[in-house]
């Protein structure tokens, strides 16, 4: 069973997540933002379910697709480099969904822009934060 | 569960090419960049390069640039090292591995060793 | 490119003592680029810590990485007979992603 601590360690890497998943969603969305039309044009995949740590797996395997697009705004919207961002929700992810067993993703047949995508998982975030307090 | 499973030993002479293989399963392999690290006999790890499956970025080390060629098959999930004239320096155990974007090598394959003697 | 220095090069202790290997980088970078590996003979590398103190998945817990900046610190608390082995920090904060020399831990 999950002990108090162990709770506390995953609602403080969760909020860290959705913190730098927020920042990003901030950074494109900037009315200064001169390539948001071009970055609505990449797709991304959604999870059919996304309801448990675990399937933190579909954001992982989605990761390298949201650095390219971070590539494209400009370094001012953030204050990390996109690669820095990235790595620190790599690692977070990592550490949340850490499991022994290897979950397969499923995802739904529509993609999604960025924007539906970013707050697809600051949704699941929250979600799961709530249940933690 | 996740598997790298690389093709086998090799044995070549100077101035041959050669392409050796890593099949990965259990895992999205057009998500992940796949690495490849040379181990020379008895010394450490160099990282030569990776590859994204799913679009073919790809990225050489400054070291192995023009001395290698990475590639893949997203639809046989397969990447690929390759060499078109090899040489005897080239003798070493070649690893490949499923990289995260962070740059860690989570799951390694089991190592394919290339001996180039004439 | 950074340049990962390991010391010491070989550390010679007994099994239950405790372990300390260290990996200097030439240029600072942000510790969730840090990784350790272990390698055995004969076998592939294998992931040990990431982000310079999350422990891998099925990593035993008397492993452990802390540091910062350009200092990162691999502990084992107490060495079990399988821990002896070669071990490699690596980075990823500029491309290219290097590796350190090793470190070889030994029984004694």
């Known amino acids: 069973a999950p002990t108090s601590s162990s709770t506390k360690k995953t609602q403080l890497q969760l909020e860290h997540l959705l913190l730098d998943l927020q920042m990003i969603l901030n950074g494109i969305n900037n009315y200064k933002n001169p390539k948001l039309t071009r970055m609505l044009t990449f797709k991304f995949y959604m999870p059919k379910k996304a309801t448990e740590l675990k399937h933190l797996q579909c954001l992982e395997e989605e990761l390298k697709p949201l650095e390219e697009v971070l590539n494209l705004a400009q370094s001012k919207n953030f204050h990390l480099r996109p690669r820095d961002l990235i790595s620190n929700i790599n690692v977070i992810v990592l550490e949340l969904k850490g499991s022994e067993t290897t979950f397969m993703c499923e995802y739904a047949d529509e993609t999604a822009t960025i924007v539906e995508f970013l707050n697809r998982w600051i949704t699941f975030c929250q979600s799961i934060i709530s249940t933690l307090t | 569960e996740v598997q790298l499973v690389q093709s086998g030993a090799e044995v070549k002479k100077p101035g041959e090419s050669l392409k050796i293989s890593c099949k990965g399963s259990g895992y999205r392999f057009t998500s992940y960049w796949i690495g490849w690290v040379r181990q020379m006999p008895g010394k450490g790890l160099e990282w030569m390069g990776i590859i994204y499956p799913g679009d073919s970025d790809t990225r050489y080390s400054p070291s192995f640039q023009g001395q290698v060629t990475i590639s893949a098959d997203k639809s046989i999930s397969a990447a690929y090292l390759q060499w078109s004239s090899l040489k005897a320096s080239d003798t070493a155990m070649y690893y490949c591995?499923?990289?995260?974007?962070?740059?860690?090598?989570?799951?390694w394959g089991q190592g394919t060793l290339v001996t180039v003697s004439s | 490119e950074i340049v990962l220095t390991q010391s010491p090069g070989t550390l010679s202790l007994s099994p239950g003592e405790r372990a300390t290997l260290s990996c200097r980088a030439s240029?600072?970078?942000?510790?969730?680029?840090l990784v350790w590996y272990q390698q055995k003979p004969g076998q592939a590398p294998r992931l040990l810590i990431y982000?310079?103190?999350s422990r891998a998945t099925g990593i035993p817990d008397r492993f452990g990485g802390s540091g910062s900046g350009t200092d990162f610190t691999l502990t084992i608390s107490r060495l079990e007979p399988e821990d002896f082995a070669v071990y490699y920090c690596?980075?990823?904060?500029?491309?290219?992603?290097?590796f350190g020399g090793g470190t070889k831990v030994e029984i004694k």
């Open positions: 591995a499923r990289q995260q974007v962070a740059g860690m090598l989570d799951y």
């Open positions: 690596q980075q990823y904060g500029s491309s290219p992603l290097t």
């Open positions: 240029q600072s970078f942000s510790s969730s680029y």
């Open positions: 982000g310079a103190s």
